[in-house]
């Protein structure tokens, strides 16, 4: 008995469907045993679906009832499953196990990793610190959603809408602006991006003199 998944990693967008491939080969014609899919996480493992060759009955894990379909060719050699309505909770490693009582090797398995893709949500831009000349401030940018985790980059524009270089690396967040001055004034755009999307937010920086600090 041999079991294989044709891909190590699968990527699929949230809300869509994905087929996790699994095929098995055996010389046994009298099939008695199981096909089982488990979801393996560091914190726990849970059953996705179990199919009994003899009773032809399925058992579905709670989170997968009405959302998982086993291949129509399960009795032949195709143990693949399709998961519908993907959510972020479906991220993880899935293990396909096939056991046949009359096969010498009895049980074999293979794995596939599922990465559910979600474009970044519109990031929140905010300023930490007082916008007073001479102060240091931090510009933060964060997307609540995004898979894979979004990458953040910054661009800066002066009052004349001309892009200007940033004195520190433009990627990552937060962006630290030291000893701010009127030269720092303008607006800053944070771009949050991953493999499936891009979103941005902007912040206006207008340093005021210390005398205006109340």
């Amino acid at each position: 008995l041999t079991v294989e998944t044709t891909q190590d990693i699968l990527r699929a967008a949230r809300g869509r469907s994905v087929t996790l491939p699994c095929t098995y080969n055996t010389y046994v014609s009298d099939r008695e045993g199981f096909i089982q899919w488990d979801k393996l996480l560091r914190s726990q493992t849970e059953r996705v679906v179990t199919w009994n060759f003899v009773t032809k009955k399925y058992i579905y894990g709670n989170r997968y009832e009405n959302r998982v379909r086993v291949s129509n060719d399960a009795e032949l050699s195709n143990a693949s499953i399709t998961i519908d309505q993907l959510t972020m909770d479906d991220n993880g490693t899935y293990e396909c196990s096939v056991s046949l009582m009359s096969d010498q090797d009895v049980n074999a398995k293979s794995r596939v990793r599922l990465l559910v893709l979600v474009p970044p949500s519109k990031p929140d831009c905010s300023i930490q610190g007082e916008m007073v000349i001479g102060n240091n401030i931090q510009l933060t940018c964060h997307s609540a959603e995004g898979s894979p985790s979004p990458q953040y980059s910054w661009k800066s524009y002066n009052a004349q809408n001309q892009q200007r270089p940033l004195t520190q690396p433009v990627s990552g967040e937060p962006l630290l602006l030291k000893n701010i001055s009127t030269e720092t004034a303008g607006y800053y755009i944070c771009t949050s991006s991953n493999d499936v999307g891009i979103e941005s937010c902007n912040i206006t920086v207008a340093p005021r003199p210390p005398s205006m600090n109340i």
Partner: antibody, heavy 118, light 107 residues
Framework: QVQLVQSGGGLVKPGGSLRLSCAAS????????MNWVRQAPGKGLEWVSS????????YYADSVKGRFTISRDDAKNSLYLQMNSLRAEDTAVYYC???????????WGQGTLVTVSS | AIQMTQSPSSLSASVGDRVTITCRAS??????LNWYQQKPGKAPKLLIY???SLQSGVPSRFSGSGSGTDFTLTISSLQPEDFATYYC?????????FGQGTKVEIK
């Protein structure tokens, strides 16, 4: 035929360590998840730990997390449970059990007694 | 963790009696429920898996039913060798958990 033969139990002082072994035969050991289950004297069964067939996913009961380590050596067809910082409440008969798809815990070892006492 | 509660904790019955043991899960476990029999000084033995499937070699007087949170083990006609302790166990999600056991004694 499938066999699970256990060894390594005994008397140990609180705070001490012990390593249990479970030697498997009669099946392709490397294809199966394996488990440890224990039973305190006069009490019920308590699942202790599980290890995936490839040895990269390990799970533990809260009562032993951080103190016990499950491992396997497929070349030797053996399952292990390293028990550290032992407490009186760890006193129990420990069983290894095979976990098959569809039929979990279908074969069990004979059990080995671990006594934690000063 | 999913809690498993068995009832009764013990029962007295005679040979030939019909015996029913129940098991309740603290949350739905679909049909990932197994029943084991254990005799003193011995390792547990798998009787029923997937709530209602009889393990190979187990007499047909044993049967299981239920899904979701409520499950039942029935022995249709108790035999002398059936006096033992019975445990339910969920295998839906780790940590796998057992019920506290039901001891079936001779009346």
């Amino acid at each position: 035929q499938v066999q699970l033969v256990q060894s390594g139990g005994g008397l140990v002082k609180p705070g001490g360590s012990l390593r249990l072994s479970c030697a498997a035969s009669g099946f392709t050991f490397s294809n199966y998840n394996m488990n440890w289950v224990r039973q305190a004297p006069g009490k019920g069964l308590e699942w202790v730990s599980s290890i995936s067939s490839s040895g990269d996913f390990m799970y533990y009961a809260d009562s032993v997390k951080g103190r016990f380590t499950i491992s396997r050596d497929d070349a030797k067809n053996s399952l292990y449970l390293q028990m550290n910082s032992l407490r009186a409440e760890d006193t129990a008969v420990y069983y290894c059990a095979r976990e098959g798809p569809g039929t979990p815990f279908d074969y069990w070892g004979q059990g080995t007694l671990v006594t934690v006492s000063s | 963790a999913i809690q498993m509660t068995q009832s009764p904790s013990s029962l007295s019955a005679s040979v030939g009696d019909r015996v029913t043991i129940t098991c309740r899960a603290s949350q739905s476990i679909s049909s990932y429920l197994n029943w084991y029999q254990q005799k003193p000084g011995k390792a547990p033995k798998l009787l029923i898996y997937a709530a209602s499937s009889l393990q190979s070699g187990v007499p047909s007087r044993f049967s299981g039913s239920g899904s979701g949170t409520d499950f039942t083990l029935t022995i249709s006609s108790l035999q002398p060798e059936d006096f033992a302790t019975y445990y339910c166990q969920q295998s839906y999600r780790t940590p796998y958990t057992f019920g506290q056991g039901t001891k079936v004694e001779i009346k």
